[in-house]
């Protein structure tokens, strides 16, 4: 099974009153009893930092990217890894720490004016001259968000779902990511049997809309595991 259970230490830190600060974001003090996480190990030590399984960069922290921990490793086993600092090797922008971007395989500083031109060039080459999609590459930049007023419409390049307008999500399309419609009731969805497997899809579907979940279609229960059809169904 994909679910592994953390050991049963109780939460020791009670939250503060409404609106109060609650410790340092990112600090992991202790874990809840019996919380389920994807992955193959039963985590015995909760005081130590445990890597977070992921399928794409947006699932990770702001200073992380999602990749296999070993070079040429199994694409299905990906975790959030620390971002690469300036002058380190990279393959894409998300690998570089904030304030940097990936140029010719090296993380370089994203000097605003210089960087903006680089990115416009990249997008124009790949997707035509649609400047409303610039925001798709802003995760690892120092560009001001004031430059972008509208959320991406269907087909716009994006990096994460919050780049897209309401009712859309950011999903892979060939080797880029674009805003696609969130799935409606009855639409076919993708249920991943192992976390990270949708890292292999080149036409990724959105998730099911609010109040829906991706489940096996009733009349497909008898089908073999590999051919089961999943659709978005009411909870």
């Amino acid at each position: 099974t994909l679910n592994s259970v953390l050991n049963s230490n109780a939460i020791k830190n009670l939250p503060p009153p409404l609106g109060g600060a609650a410790g340092h974001p990112g600090s992991a003090v202790s874990a809840a009893p019996g919380i389920l996480y994807p992955g193959g190990n039963k985590y015995q030590t909760i005081d130590n930092y445990q890597p977070y399984p992921c399928a794409e960069d947006e699932e990770c922290g702001t200073d992380e990217y999602c990749a296999s921990p070993t070079r040429g490793g199994d694409a299905g086993v990906q975790i959030c890894l620390a971002c690469r600092k300036r002058r380190k090797r990279c393959m894409r922008h998300a690998m570089c720490c904030p304030g940097n971007y990936c140029k010719n395989g090296i993380c370089v500083s994203s000097d605003q004016n210089h960087f903006r031109g680089e990115i416009e060039e990249t997008i124009t080459e790949s997707f035509g001259n649609d400047h409303s999609t610039l925001d798709g590459y802003s995760r690892r930049t120092t560009l001001s968000s004031k430059m972008y007023h509208t959320k991406g419409q269907e087909g716009s390049v994006c990096l994460r779902s919050s780049d897209c307008a309401s009712g859309l999500c950011c999903a892979r399309h060939f080797w880029s990511k674009i805003c696609k419609p969130v799935l409606k009731e009855g639409q076919v969805c993708t249920k991943h049997r192992r976390k990270g497997s949708h890292g292999l899809e080149i036409f990724q579907r959105c998730y099911c809309g609010e109040g829906l979940s991706c489940r096996i279609q009733k009349d497909h229960h008898q089908a073999s595991n590999s051919s089961r059809l999943h659709t978005c169904q009411r909870h």
Epitope: L6, I11, N13, L14, P15, L18, G19, G20, A21, A22, G23, H24, P25, G26, S27, A28, V29, S30, A31, A32, I35, Y37, G39, Y43, I46, Y49, Q50, P51, Y52, P53, A55, E56, E58, E59, C60, G61, T62, D63, E64, C80, A82, R160, S161, S162, C169, Y207
Partner: nanobody
Framework: EVQLVESGGGSVQAGGSLRLSCTAS????????VAWFRQAPGKEREFVAA????????HYANSVEGRFTISRDNAKNTAFMQMSSLKPEDTAVYYC??????????????????????WGQGTQVTVSS
């Protein structure tokens, strides 16, 4: 400053369902994880479920897996928790909380209460047998 307001609590018979809502105001919370914690009388506050900033990732406590479903609608700045097949042991005050996307995320991040900067006042859920 983010303010969180829970609604949807109430009394229900065992086996019944409730849907909790958590509405945020003050700033968009699409770069926050949203979670539900609960506290029964005389017990510690415990993690129930969380949904990450990326929308696609949800986490549940063993005790509610398969019965509760967490979701969110960023356009409405609202998170939801559909609770079904409720049991008397689900009786508690349910709190909604928001945690900022951290620099580094670990498996413990979502269930650790000290990571959550903003909390609602809670909504009572009572399940009678």
């Amino acid at each position: 400053e983010v303010q969180l307001v829970e609604s949807g609590g109430g009394s229900v018979q065992a086996g019944g369902s409730l849907r909790l809502s958590c509405t945020a105001s003050g700033r968009p919370f699409d770069n926050y994880a949203v979670a539900w914690f609960r506290q029964a009388p005389g017990k510690e506050r415990e993690f129930v479920a969380a949904i990450s900033w990326s929308l696609s990732r949800t986490h549940y406590a063993n005790s509610v897996e398969g019965r509760f479903t967490i979701s969110r609608d960023n356009a409405k700045n609202t998170a939801f928790m559909q609770m079904s097949s409720l049991k008397p042991e689900d009786t508690a005050v349910y709190y909604c909380a928001a945690a900022p996307r951290p620099k580094r995320v670990s498996v413990q991040y979502f269930s650790t209460s000290s990571n959550y900067d903003y909390w609602g006042q809670g909504t009572q859920v009572t399940v009678s047998s």
